[in-house]
Amino acid sequence: DSSKWVFEHPETLYAWEGACVWIPCTYRALDGDLESFILFHNPEYNKNTSKFDGTRLYESTKDGKVPSEQKRVQFLGDKNKNCTLSIHPVHLNDSGQLGLRMESKTEKWMERIHLNVSERPFPPHIQLPPEIQESQEVTLTCLLNFSCYGYPIQLQWLLEGVPMRQAAVTSTSLTIKSVFTRSELKFSPQWSHHGKIVTCQLQDADGKFLSNDTVQLNVKHTPKLEIKVTPSDAIVREGDSVTMTCEVSSSNPEYTTVSWLKDGTSLKKQNTFTLNLREVTKDQSGKYCCQVSNDVGPGRSEEVFLQVQYAPEPSTVQILHSPAVEGSQVEFLCMSLANPLPTNYTWYHNGKEMQGRTEEKVHIPKILPWHAGTYSCVAENILGTGQRGPGAELDVQYPPKKVTTV
């Protein structure tokens, strides 16, 4: 409507006792420059006098009359565009409607702005994303509908009462569209943050507490598990029994399924929180864990390495290299499956014990013709002595010896 003055400013401004209020404001008059400006508090139109009644907070007229409130209220505008105002300090009884009475040479206008002044600093508001998942970065937002050039404030983030280490980005807006102070914190919550209290604290320039808002984190996470084993060292002998128990220390939402894995492969028909292994064999040695799932996904416990100990199995001998040339070096390796590893070896050459050879490997620095033959070994560990395997044949190649002519 071309018969109206055009104003732009926030609809309502918020402050508290003793703070200040900065009112960003622009206008366009119907004709000519502004000649008179009066700022009313809760103006009411008097039909009898055809004028507005109310407390005059500020007055700027041709004759220069100025109310005593003038020191507290500043008109920072001009005669044709800017109608920005500042009230510093602002008081509780300033709450209500501010009326901007504007007069040009031929036209008059009353523009109303709402001012909400609280007794104490009002709390900021924490905004969280609709869902928070562990290890996924989220942005926490703390918003306060307040900003004023004459009253610096700060917003601080706390987790369980302790300042958060992550760097927050604070921004302020003092525009005709909005007035606010906002702090944004990028944060990768862990499952252990579930149920923890996050606080956004409003402080003055000196760090003095003014108000706060708190939220409880709801961090969706896969089940967190603890595995317990009896015996606790997970070292048993063949024929012993083993019990593993899976405990859910945390799950959000609640868990739905349970399974057990050995060496990464699921064990069939094992869907309870207890895994009983009776009369274990050495084939059951391996890495065990439990897996519990919820709507977020599967959670796995740490792995338990089950060691089923047994005496050495019949040994085999590997020869590097056969056939060997006389004078070359040869290495023999005794191979025997055992748990724990063998601690002692006995070596045989053509069935006769090789004195002083008690290690897994035997080196012969220079091979001679009489070193040819069958090499075998026996491995020994704390559980017993293995059997001598078939052995390996060393062939020694050598030049002719003691050539005689017939």
Partner: antibody
Framework: QVTLKESGPGILQPSQTLSLTCSFS??????????VGWIRQPSGKGLEWLAH???????YYNPALKSRLTISKDTSKNQVFLKIANVDTADTATYYC????????????????WGTGTTVTVSA | QAVVTQESALTTSPGETVTLTCRSS?????????ANWVQEKPDHLFTGLIG???NRAPGVPARFSGSLIGDKAALTITGAQTEDEAIYFC?????????FGSGTKVTVLG
């Protein structure tokens, strides 16, 4: 009975080449598992292994002296030779030859029989 | 080049057991060092005792034995006799050369 006997010049001057001979009996260097090595002992000090040679012509040298040493054998004469080039006073020592053998039924070598040594003095 | 270290001197009595050790500056002595032990008696009389860490040379008395103790080679004389008074040298093989130790003087107090 195995015996080894060293022989050398007794005295020689710096920068000359020292030639040593080890004559042995009671074994042959054509027999598998037999070797002869040279070891020296400066007066009042420890032993220093120099080189050894096996029946199959395998030769091994002390890395610190390798450029100056040459070991060789004459199997038919039962002799092993060691040459040390460009001698210095630090080469003054008693030089021993020793049999290094892998006896029948064994898998390792032994410095089993030694000569009584020959004294060499390098002097200007 | 490696340095082979031995005790400079040890004293024992007849019938007692004495152990001599041989350390390598390059780390633990292993069977791949084929430790040899040589005895020197007065008048430069040398005799080989042990080869390949723990094998007695033919004709060497059974009271002499070789072994590995921890990271060192060892020569043990079990039931020392007065004629065992001598200097004992160890020699270690380093893939293509021997290095002798400085020798241990063993005194058998009669």
């Amino acid at each position: 009975q195995v015996t080894l006997k060293e022989s050398g010049p007794g005295i020689l001057q710096p920068s000359q080449t020292l030639s040593l001979t080890c004559s042995f009996s009671g074994f042959s260097l054509s027999t598998s598992g037999m070797g002869v090595g040279w070891i020296r002992q400066p007066s009042g000090k420890g032993l220093e292994w120099l080189a050894h040679i096996w029946w199959d012509d395998d030769e091994y040298y002390n890395p610190a002296l390798k450029s100056r040493l040459t070991i060789s054998k004459d199997t038919s004469k039962n002799q092993v030779f060691l040459k040390i080039a460009n001698v210095d006073t630090a080469d003054t020592a008693t030089y021993y030859c020793a049999r290094i053998s892998i006896p029948y039924g064994y898998y390792d070598w032994f410095f089993d029989v030694w000569g009584t040594g020959t004294t060499v003095t390098v002097s200007a | 080049q490696a340095v082979v270290t031995q005790e400079s001197a040890l004293t024992t009595s007849p019938g007692e057991t004495v152990t001599l050790t041989c350390r390598s500056s390059t780390g633990a002595v292993t069977t791949r060092n084929y430790a040899n032990w040589v005895q020197e008696k007065p008048d430069h009389l040398f005799t080989g005792l042990i080869g390949g860490t723990n094998n007695r040379a033919p004709g060497v008395p059974a009271r002499f034995s070789g072994s590995l103790i921890g990271d060192k080679a060892a020569l043990t004389i079990t039931g020392a006799q007065t004629e065992d008074e001598a200097i004992y040298f160890c020699a270690l093989w380093y893939s293509n050369h021997f290095i002798f130790g400085s020798g241990t003087k063993v005194t058998v107090l009669g």
